[in-house]
Interface confidence: low
């Protein structure tokens, strides 16, 4: 789990001074002047460091009070329509940080597994109430990773309007049910997204050029389930020019055979397909229409799987997925506990990476590092991981460029600006930029070779398979080649 990994920072940089307002204009509907920040990182080519230096020097020279920090906080807004609620009937909501000069809106769907029966929802309510109720939500949240307004932490979209939508529906953002006699809980994930979009139109979203619906884990799957519906909603409300795109992080799951089969008792060990099958009925779950029409009644669970729903989507979607995703391994009962693993488990894990890689073959915009981890885009050091020399923010920038205004990923990738980035090396952490691993018990950092040997990886056997000297293989592992 989480205790095993930390993120490596590639050299701490000082926080940037706040950017000065560049021009003033009237905010729609208010007559009040608003600050506008026309600098836009996604349009920057070439040397990012040099550009950053220019921005900083410009900011410091124009902004005498540079000790003041930009307020990083997103502020809580509970939905005005209080009939759209969390599991326990408390109003759902969103956290917002506006950026008046920007026509980009990032809506992030939080993750956090799910529950699919009265019993395991009761248990979830006892232990993880924040994921089922808004009663104890803080008034503010700090934007991190792709939700950060600091250019160093978020070179991709630091200037966007940031929206964090807390997950409190436990339904993978699919539910459209209301309180009834037989249901203690309500499941309104899909309705929450719809209502948040509706309310944001009155807070400036109406002027957006691009809406990026992003999410991690269950939120990543939520993106796949809802992105087309959001586009449709905006078209119906008379905003067809807003370009809706998706960014699904760690939500691309496989219906592969479990490493060890278990009965469907609790959320974590129940095979995902069975959990979702039960969940859809319990939640009154909705899946995208075009996907649903491809499966017969009762088989809608297929549309929760990225590789099955993706080909039916109209909106462009960028898929981010660790090849060795911890949630997938947990659901497959193959997670690495810190104990040495048997050969069968190694083969299973390697095969998982291979299968996942295959499902991403026809996904033009994808970023899949060969790491054992879960979630990335709202981690502060999300910029550190690279695939084939390209970081995720850079890949997203290239994706923006490839889309231009056409809403379709172009067939020929832009020169020097790749968007299909899937690691080809075959085992966990064969990519040297993976999040650093720590021994679960000692807290000691491990390099790739140490980690693999600690997990029972047989250097001798693998070297033989690859036709290499064991020492050469160890060298390759340590350097990540």
């Amino acid at each position: 789990g989480e205790g095993r990994k930390t993120w490596r920072r590639r050299g701490q940089q000082p926080a940037p001074a706040p950017l000065p307002p560049q021009r003033t204009e009237a905010a729609p509907g208010t007559g009040q002047p608003v600050e506008s920040f026309p600098l836009d990182f996604t349009a920057v080519e070439g040397n990012m460091d040099s550009f950053m230096a220019q921005v900083k020097s410009l900011a410091q020279s124009l902004y005498p009070c540079s000790a003041q920090q930009l307020n990083e906080d997103l502020r809580l807004h509970l939905l005005l329509n209080t009939s759209v609620t969390c599991n326990d009937g408390s109003p759902a909501g969103y956290y917002l940080k506006e950026s008046k000069g920007s026509r980009r809106w990032l809506l992030f769907l939080e993750g956090g597994w799910y529950c699919f029966s009265r019993e395991n929802c009761d248990s979830r309510y006892d232990t993880m109430r924040r994921l089922m109720s808004s009663k104890d939500w803080p008034q503010t949240r700090t934007g991190t990773g792709i939700l950060s307004s600091q250019p160093e932490e978020n070179p991709y979209w630091w200037n966007a309007n940031m929206v964090f939508i807390p997950y409190c529906s436990s339904d993978v953002w699919s539910g459209a049910s209301s309180k009834s006699e037989k249901n203690e809980y309500v499941f309104m994930g899909a309705l929450i997204i719809r209502e948040v979009v509706q309310e944001l139109l009155g807070r400036g979203l109406s002027g957006a050029k691009v809406l990026l619906l992003a999410g991690s884990s269950a939120g990543g799957t939520g993106v796949l389930l809802n992105v087309d519906r959001v586009a449709e909603q905006l078209e119906q409300l008379g905003y067809p020019a807003i370009q809706v795109r998706g960014l699904a992080d760690s939500g691309w799951f496989l219906d592969n055979k479990q490493y060890r089969r278990t009965d469907c008792v609790d959320t974590v060990t129940c095979a995902p397909t069975e959990a979702i099958r039960r969940g859809i009925r319990y939640w009154n779950g909705m899946v995208p229409e075009r996907c649903r029409s491809q499966f017969k009644e009762g088989e809608e669970w297929n549309c929760f799987l990225g590789y099955k729903v993706y080909p039916t989507l109209r909106c462009p979607v960028f898929v981010v997925q660790w090849l060795f995703d911890e949630a997938q391994l947990t659901a497959d009962n193959a997670h690495l506990t810190g104990q040495p693993v048997q050969e069968g488990q190694w083969l299973y894990i390697q095969n998982l990476g291979h299968e996942l890689r295959n499902t991403l073959k026809d996904v033009p915009a994808s970023f899949a590092p060969a790491c054992l981890s879960h979630e990335i885009i709202i981690r502060s050091h999300w910029t550190d991981v690279q695939v084939k020399g390209t970081s995720l923010p850079r890949a997203l920038h290239c994706w923006d460029r490839s889309l231009h205004d056409s809403h379709k990923a172009s067939k020929t990738p832009l020169k020097g600006c790749p968007i299909h980035l899937v690691d080809s090396c075959p085992w966990p952490h064969c990519n040297p930029s993976c999040p650093t691993i720590r021994d679960q018990f000692t807290g000691q950092e491990m390099n790739v070779a140490q980690f693999l040997m600690h997990m029972g990886f047989d250097v001798q056997t693998v070297a033989q398979q690859q036709g290499l000297e064991p020492s050469k293989l160890l060298g390759m592992l340590s350097s990540g080649s």
């Epitope: 005005l80 309310e199 109406s206 020019a241 231009h404 056409s406």
Partner: antibody, heavy 119, light 111 residues
Framework: EVQLVESGGGLVKPGGSLKLSCAAS????????MHWFRQAPEKGLEWVAY????????YYADTVKGRFTISRDNAKNTLSLQMTSLRSEDTAMYYC????????????WGTGTTVTVSS | DIVLTQSPASLAVSLGQRATISCRAS??????????MHWYQQKPGQPPKLLIY???NLESGVPARFSGSGSGTDFTLNIHPVEEEDAATYYC?????????FGSGTKLEIK
């Protein structure tokens, strides 16, 4: 200077066809949704068609659906309206207009081109 | 479609006085603090010109004697003090949904 200039109007017989063009200059054309409107002599303004900035979405008024086609070429900064099966009630001054991206109002209008459908 | 009813159809106002034009929508065109109603001026032989957007915001370059107000379904355009050059037809337009529709127009004459 931000400008829209229509062309292609003229006299045409009922059932005939005509293609109107609108040349944009002075702004980033590809950033904006564009609309066609018309105004019959001594009458009010009527919306005809809409095309989104990247041509992904098009909408038509019921009165022209199936007969008119809106298109755009962002590389050439031009908007077009192909009109077929013209009727006498299509006689009007045709305007292209730029939809402001915030709020759906029209902040730039062309000077108009006249279409007369008569036998 | 949303129907916009403008009144009066025409009015004559003395130079320097106030002109008030009303526009009523067949359904609410405001949501979450924004009112999707706009006002245009059109002179003979010319295209419409945007005056007021989102109910009350003055378009750049438009004289401050023009002002807009209202929310929900009822909106008003005021011109004060009226000047000679304000003789024109005025239209309201909503953008709450597609299709955008216009009022039938109010013709302003200067006495």
């Amino acid at each position: 200077e931000v400008q829209l200039v229509e062309s292609g109007g003229g006299l045409v017989k009922p059932g005939g066809s005509l293609k109107l063009s609108c040349a944009a200059s002075g702004f980033t054309f590809s950033d904006y949704g564009m609309h066609w409107f018309r105004q019959a002599p001594e009458k009010g303004l009527e919306w005809v068609a809409y095309i989104s900035s990247g041509s992904r979405t098009v909408y038509y008024a019921d009165t022209v659906k199936g007969r008119f086609t809106i298109s755009r070429d962002n590389a050439k900064n031009t908007l077009s309206l192909q009109m077929t099966s013209l009727r006498s009630e299509d006689t009007a001054m045709y305007y292209c207009a730029r939809k402001h991206y915030n709020g759906g109002y029209f902040d730039v209008w062309g000077t108009g081109t006249t279409v007369t459908v008569s036998s | 479609d949303i129907v916009l009813t403008q009144s009066p159809a025409s009015l004559a106002v003395s130079l320097g006085q106030r002109a008030t034009i009303s526009c009523r929508a067949s359904k609410i065109v405001s949501t979450s603090g924004y009112s999707y109603m706009h006002w245009y001026q059109q002179k003979p032989g010319q295209p419409p010109k945007l005056l007021i957007y989102l109910a009350s915001n003055l378009e750049s370059g438009v004289p401050a004697r023009f002002s807009g107000s209202g929310s929900g379904t009822d909106f008003t355009l005021n011109i004060h003090p009226v000047e000679e050059e304000d003789a024109a037809t005025y239209y309201c337009q909503h953008s709450r949904e597609l299709p955008p529709t216009f009022g039938s127009g109010t013709k302003l004459e200067i006495k």
